[in-house]
């Protein structure tokens, strides 16, 4: 059966602990807090557990009312401007956890696919109403992964102001339509982001130094579609000093040929390019202006593809993408279903990894592990995966350093602080730090060699193709080289 991913902690090597983190200090003569750099993990990557315990106890002792401050909950705020709504006309909103001492703001766009016709939006409304309506949203949400305020779970930005924006527009955060007679649903994804930013200015965002617009899956694509517009909005409102950046997780899709062509009937089977083509019309979808101008009318769907929109963006964007993304494979009808795969499907999957790697060649800030998975940044164990020995929070920290006091990425990477991290091994889970795979029927954990054989992978044939002894290949697979 198909393996399934869970997360495991990696073995830790001891390393010397660095200086403790600083909170904030007043800039001379201004009374304004100046936030120190994120922690520099150069020396600590191995011995994270004991280091984080020290950081946490220090944070608690330094922070007034620390027990309250370490409450993980983000609180729901429905938009005051009730004309900006979810699909069903209920008000959109956001969850917020303020961090008074910080000038960093993290705005996270939730994912959850899309719908692109009356029929499949009806079905979505009937079975996933939370993604189309705010009527039953809970009053609080727990921040996890990059949204966590616990330094051991979020060594990157644990002290930031955290904002989770629920996805209730089903339009990949692109829509700018309003209620009309002919439309049963409204699609306001782009307008929701704009309104959230507008309302957050009154809640402290106006004093921000950095706004990081992050998102996973459809939210990751939403980052690519909206990051420049957010920067422009803040500039126009008189906040040009706020540095706007993007973090797109699992939203970098390819318009490759489907493994098996299917008719565009529903969200699950429709080829993504066709779904987006139809969707843009249905949603009145907006794409970044600089990208739109490169394509003729009716071809705006191209701007939903990371590798086409990215070169047109002005804001720095960090791209996180599994080389074997499950949503891409689902859209390509090449997903693994627990049955051994055919050789053609195996080659298709390998080729997907190769193509994706190529599209990231010129993306200076990227993290792309050779794993079969989907989404990472709000998983609790997002710190576990490494590419070339570097974890994602560490890579993001290096990216921050490379951008320090500048809107553009520095051309020369910082020594010992890499930001372009793309796996070069060719198979799903050839990276040993990938999320654990479990056998779909027994629930047993599998190593990569077991997984590949389980998938019908022919060790003899592949060893021959690679010019290796089968035993050598199995050894390499097990060690992840």
């Amino acid at each position: 059966g198909e393996g399934r991913k869970t997360w495991r902690r990696r073995g830790q090597q001891p390393a010397p602990a660095p200086l403790p983190p600083q909170r904030t200090e007043a800039a001379p003569g201004t009374g304004q807090p100046v936030e120190s750099f994120p922690l520099d993990f150069t020396a600590v990557e191995g011995n994270m557990d004991s280091f984080m315990a020290q950081v946490k106890s220090l944070a608690q002792s330094l922070y007034p009312c620390s027990a309250q401050q370490l409450n993980e909950d983000l609180r729901l705020h429905l938009l005051l401007n009730t004309s900006v709504t979810c699909n069903d006309g209920s008000p959109a909103g956001y969850y917020l956890k303020e961090s008074k001492g910080s000038r960093r703001w993290l705005l996270f766009l939730e994912g959850g696919w899309y719908c692109f016709s009356r029929e499949n939006c009806d079905s979505r409304y009937d079975t996933m109403r939370r993604l189309m309506s705010s009527k039953d949203w809970p009053q609080t949400r727990t921040g996890t992964g990059i949204l966590s305020s616990q330094p051991e779970e979020n060594p990157y930005w644990w002290n930031a102001n955290m904002v989770f924006i629920p996805y209730c527009s089903s339009d990949v955060w692109s829509g700018a339509s309003s209620k009309s007679e002919k439309n049963e649903y409204v699609f306001m994804g782009a307008l929701i982001i704009r309104e959230v930013v507008q309302e957050l200015l009154g809640r402290g965002l106006s004093g921000a130094k950095v706004l990081l617009l992050a998102g996973s899956s459809a939210g990751g694509t939403g980052v690519l579609l909206n990051v420049d517009r957010v920067a422009e909005q803040l500039e126009q409102l008189g906040y040009p000093a706020i540095q706007v950046r993007g973090l797109a997780d699992s939203g970098w899709f390819l318009d490759n040929k489907q493994y098996r062509r299917t008719d565009c009937v529903d969200t699950v089977t429709c080829a993504p390019t066709e779904a987006i083509r139809r969707g843009i019309r249905y949603w009145n979808g907006m794409v970044p202006e600089r990208c739109r101008s490169q394509f003729k009318e009716g071809e705006e769907w191209n701007c939903f593809l990371g590798y086409k929109v990215y070169p047109t963006l002005r804001c720095p964007v960090f791209v996180v993408q599994w080389l074997f993304d499950e949503a891409q494979l689902t859209a390509d009808n090449a997903h693994l279903t627990g049955q051994p795969v055919q050789e053609g499907q195996w080659l298709y999957i390998q080729n997907l990894g190769h193509e994706l790697r190529n599209t990231l060649k010129d993306v200076p800030a990227s993290f792309a592990p050779a794993c079969l998975s989907h989404e990472i940044i709000i998983r609790s164990h997002w710190t576990d995966v490494q590419v070339k020995g570097t974890s994602l929070p560490r890579a993001l920290h290096c990216w921050d350093r490379s951008l320090h006091d500048s809107h553009k990425a520095s051309k020369t990477p910082l020594k010992g602080c890499p930001i372009h991290l793309v796996d070069s091994c060719p198979w799903p889970h050839c990276n040993p730090s990938c999320p654990t795979i479990r056998d779909q029927f027994t629930g047993q954990e599998m190593n990569v060699a077991q997984f590949l054989m389980h998938m019908g992978f022919d060790v003899q044939t592949v060893a021959q193709q690679q010019g290796l002894e089968p035993s050598k290949l199995l050894g390499m697979l097990s060690s992840g080289s």
Partner: antibody, heavy 116, light 107 residues
Framework: DVQLVESGGGLVQPGGSRKLSCAAS????????MHWVRQAPEKGLEWVAY????????YYADTVRGRFTISRDTPKNTLFLQMTSLRSEDTAMYYC?????????WGQGTSVTVSS | DIQMTQSPASLYVSVGETVTITCRAS??????LAWYQQKQGKSPQLLVY???NLADGVPSRFSGSGSGTQYSLKINSLKSEDFGSYYC?????????FGSGTKLEIK
């Protein structure tokens, strides 16, 4: 209070037909998807059919496609399941259920026995 | 079609214990999963939707977790009223198949 009440069950000969009804009250019927789910004696739940809110698009399980027809009469707040060419394996308790996020309300069920 | 493999098929436990029931999908269902409880001779009742969200009125001792293809329902400190059968169901494209069920019985 949301209520779903099924009716129309009973004993049917193999090859025969039966029409089940589900009367809905306490909510805006047109705003929810409606499903039929069945449970054979001492067995698990089996999803049978679904009609969407709004457009009324229809979906069936392979085991009943071509033999069963789901429909709704929105003004009368009623869901139907027309069953034809019945087989012994269709013997089950038939439930109607409403969906928004999961099947959040179920009727008490109506029993259908297919036997000669 | 997506298959849902639920385990264990039955579980003998005492009041006060904690139990976990798992459900595996044959492919990624992107958290579009619900859990139901059914007591003998009664209709099923929704417990969890969207893999992790507790339905209205469900006690907080119930919790859902998981993503991708593997999901679980955890019941902390079991009460006598928690005994019965539990089913998972996916909503990622029709047919919306159920798991085969887990019968929770008193030890």
């Amino acid at each position: 209070d949301v209520q779903l009440v099924e009716s129309g069950g009973g004993l049917v000969q193999p090859g025969g037909s039966r029409k089940l009804s589900c009367a809905a009250s306490g909510f805006t019927f047109s705003s929810f998807g409606m499903h039929w789910v069945r449970q054979a004696p001492e067995k698990g739940l089996e999803w049978v059919a679904y009609i969407t809110s709004g457009s009324g698009a229809i979906y069936y399980a392979d085991t009943v496609r071509g033999r069963f027809t789901i429909s709704r009469d929105t003004p009368k707040n009623t869901l139907f399941l027309q069953m034809t060419s019945l087989r012994s394996e269709d013997t089950a308790m038939y439930y109607c259920a409403r969906s928004a996020d999961g099947l959040d309300y179920w009727g008490q069920g109506t029993s259908v026995t297919v036997s000669s | 079609d997506i298959q849902m493999t639920q385990s264990p098929a039955s579980l003998y436990v005492s009041v006060g214990e904690t139990v976990t029931i798992t459900c595996r999908a044959s492919e990624n269902i992107y958290s579009n999963l619900a859990w139901y409880q059914q007591k003998q001779g009664k209709s099923p009742q929704l417990l969890v939707y969207g893999a992790t969200n507790l339905a209205d009125g469900v006690p907080s001792r119930f919790s859902g977790s998981g993503s991708g293809t593997q999901y679980s329902l955890k019941i902390n400190s079991l009460k006598s009223e928690d005994f019965g059968s539990y089913y998972c169901q996916h909503f990622w494209g029709t047919p919306f198949t159920f798991g085969s069920g887990t019968k929770l019985e008193i030890k």
